[in-house]
């Protein structure tokens, strides 16, 4: 039975050619987590595996920094970064567990972290 | 130099077994997932099973379920692949490969025939 | 199971021609694909992987893209050497599945 859920940072947003911190935290379970991907869309940004580390896709290595933690920092931010960023964690015994970011990536300087929320 | 080698291929009767090793080197095996692709003479490739670095996760395609068992030894940086009640349509090369990040499969070994006939 | 349709099956080709090969999922895959060459008797070989990431020691003539059902692999001038068989084969789920493979033989 998979009890654990997924904290993220919500819907945020940030500054063109500014950086943002993409978090996601899993709690409520003692699975242990072997995998975590983040992916935008239909893209994989990056893996970050228990026994092999970081892997950051080669199209997205000039701005894209593994952490802090199973974190993933996109750098150099722009308009085109705006969108769905997901969290998927590999985990043992349970399975995978999914957690949401929205990105929204604003031109002017009005840009605020969103609240956190959780997800089943 | 990642090496992978398999062996324990022959001719066996159909409802017969046979377990095939592939010996891993050049790298840290107990890391990785690994994976067991075979192909038929003059077909394309099947994907037979795999089981994760720490043996907790393993898969197997429907057609060899209940039937083939992946293991392996991360003290000897070996892989097996027990196959029992084979059949006339197990008859293939079996490669071993490995599976970094458990999405793509980076290094293959030179395979081993197995062949089902009586 | 996530079926995998290549095409063509097979195609001719010359020495220094542009050659694409498609591969569809049935359903969406994100970008968990990955491209493969074989070579008679020999085992295969990555040439690309998560759909457009280039493998260690392939030529930068070898490119891939897509996302989601359809994916492209591309030569972008055919070598001698890249005769051969490709295949396409989705790590979005279990059972991995390949596609049927594709054949570039010599015009």
């Known amino acids: 039975m998979m009890t654990g859920t997924i904290e993220t940072t919500g819907n945020i947003s940030a500054e063109k050619g500014g950086s943002i911190i993409l978090q996601c935290h899993l709690s409520s379970t003692t699975a242990q987590v072997t995998q975590v991907n983040w992916e935008q869309q239909d893209q994989l940004l990056a893996i970050c595996n228990a026994d092999l580390g970081w892997h950051i896709s080669p199209s997205f290595k000039d701005r894209v920094a593994p952490g802090p933690g199973l974190g993933l920092t996109l750098q150099s931010l722009t308009v085109n970064d705006t969108g769905e960023y997901f969290c998927i964690y590999h985990t043992y015994p349970d399975g995978t567990y999914t957690g949401r970011i929205f990105l929204e990536v604003l031109e002017s300087s009005v840009a605020e972290h969103g609240a956190r929320f959780q997800i089943p | 130099e990642v090496q992978l080698l398999e062996s324990g291929g022959g001719l066996v009767q159909p409802g017969g077994s046979l377990r095939l090793s592939c010996a891993a080197s050049g790298f840290t095996f107990s890391s990785y997932s690994m994976n067991w692709v075979r192909q038929a003479p003059g077909k394309g490739l099947e994907w037979v099973a795999y089981?994760?670095?720490?043996?907790?996760?393993?898969g197997y395609a429907d057609s060899v379920k209940g039937r083939f068992t992946i293991s392996r030894d991360n003290s000897k940086n070996t892989l097996y692949l027990q196959m029992n009640s084979l059949r006339a349509e197990d008859t293939a090369v079996y490669y071993c490969a490995r599976g970094p990040y458990d999405y793509w499969l980076d290094y293959w070994g030179q395979g081993t025939l197995v062949t089902v006939s009586s | 199971d996530i079926q995998m349709t290549q095409s063509p099956s097979s195609l001719s080709a010359s020495v220094g021609d542009r050659v694409t090969i498609t591969c569809r999922a049935s359903?969406?895959?994100?970008?968990?694909l990955n491209w493969y060459q074989q070579k008679p008797g020999k085992a295969p070989k990555l040439l690309i992987y998560?759909?457009?990431s280039l493998q260690s020691g392939v030529p930068s003539r070898f490119s891939g893209s897509g996302s989601g059902t359809d994916f492209t692999l591309t030569i972008s001038s055919l070598q001698p050497e890249d005769f051969a068989t490709y295949y396409c084969?989705?790590?979005?789920?279990?059972?991995?599945?390949f596609g049927g493979g594709t054949k570039v033989e010599i015009k």
């Open positions: 998560a759909a457009s």
């Open positions: 359903q969406s895959i994100s970008s968990y």
């Open positions: 084969q989705q790590s979005y789920s279990t059972p991995l599945t």
């Open positions: 089981i994760k670095s720490n043996s907790g996760t393993k």
